[in-house]
Amino acid sequence: SGRGEAETRECIYYNANWELERTNQSGLERCEGEQDKRLHCYASWRNSSGTIELVKKGCWLDDFNCYDRQECVATEENPQVYFCCCEGNFCNERFTHLPEAGGPEVTYEPPPTAPT
């Protein structure tokens, strides 16, 4: 049985390809899924010579490898696109690369929002 999972209802949303895909560029996404299925947030990005290029953020459908992850942490060594998922509202705001081979942990903080 599932125990103590953080319910995910909303995630940070971002789409680098927003113009072509005719979506919003950024904001919040309310997660919708089938009854009895868990929902997650995710982030995906590229790292070109230390420069982080955000690809997408948003809601992610029930995926067992995302269960009970409170933080969004990618562990692949050097993929074309980094991916992480997590549970809990807006848990994909920050995302981290913690390579399995024991390289340095790199956490990406969102830029501060401008005062309104």
């Epitope: 049985s1 599932g2 125990r3 103590g4 999972e5 089938e34 009895d36 299925k37 868990r38 459908l61 029930d62 995926d63 067992f64 490898n65 995302c66 269960y67 009970d68 992850r69 942490v73 562990t75 991916f83 998922c85 399995e100």
Partner: antibody, heavy 118, light 111 residues
Framework: EVQLLESGGGLVQPGGSLRLSCAAS????????MSWVRQAPGKGLEWVSG????????YYTDSVKGRFTVSRDNSRNTLYLQMNSLRAEDTAVYYC???????????WGQGTLVTVSS | QTVVTQEPSFSVSPGGTVTLTCGFN?????????PSWYQQTPGQAPRTLIY???TRSSGVPDRFSGSILGNKAALTITGAQADDESDYYC??????????FGGGTKLTVLG
Amino acid sequence: EVQLLESGGGLVQPGGSLRLSCAASGFTFRNYAMSWVRQAPGKGLEWVSGISVTGGSTYYTDSVKGRFTVSRDNSRNTLYLQMNSLRAEDTAVYYCAKVYYSSFFDYWGQGTLVTVSS
Amino acid sequence: QTVVTQEPSFSVSPGGTVTLTCGFNSGSVSTSYYPSWYQQTPGQAPRTLIYNTNTRSSGVPDRFSGSILGNKAALTITGAQADDESDYYCVLYMGSGIWVFGGGTKLTVLG
């Protein structure tokens, strides 16, 4: 290189117990959900149980609920399946499998045979 | 009780093309079930072929491809070879920590 090595299988009488282990190496065990899958002699594959990265969420196929318990020790890189009240129909090769994103089994062990017979 | 159905057996000539399917009794298979396919030869552990509907696992030849055909997941083998003779299993992830395997398809390569 990812390796999953099951152990603990053997011959047990109906009603008896066994504890299977799966020793993982070649990847960071704590970062991945894990699962047990079995195959009765001459039959197809059957999913048995799954456990999340922390061990906080565990799931079972209906036929083993209340009899089998899956657990993991992330400090020892080991997955376990405690099997109680064993029945003849639990006779199978038991495989442990690593779960990857998109909920699929990307690596499998070679399996350990459990025989339940009097 | 969810039942995942596959053709029990299938035959193909060497060099031919075969499509194995995977459906279930509760509706249509979609990408949200993350269909995956596994090959197994007698006495061996399963080998992962296709995951997330249509992504080939590393080292799998491009003769193997996955798709959704109508309301089923499908595995297509083009240019079948003798060593493709195996059992093939599909798996659907039903969500909430539950997977269901199909009964498997025994593929025979004729000749």
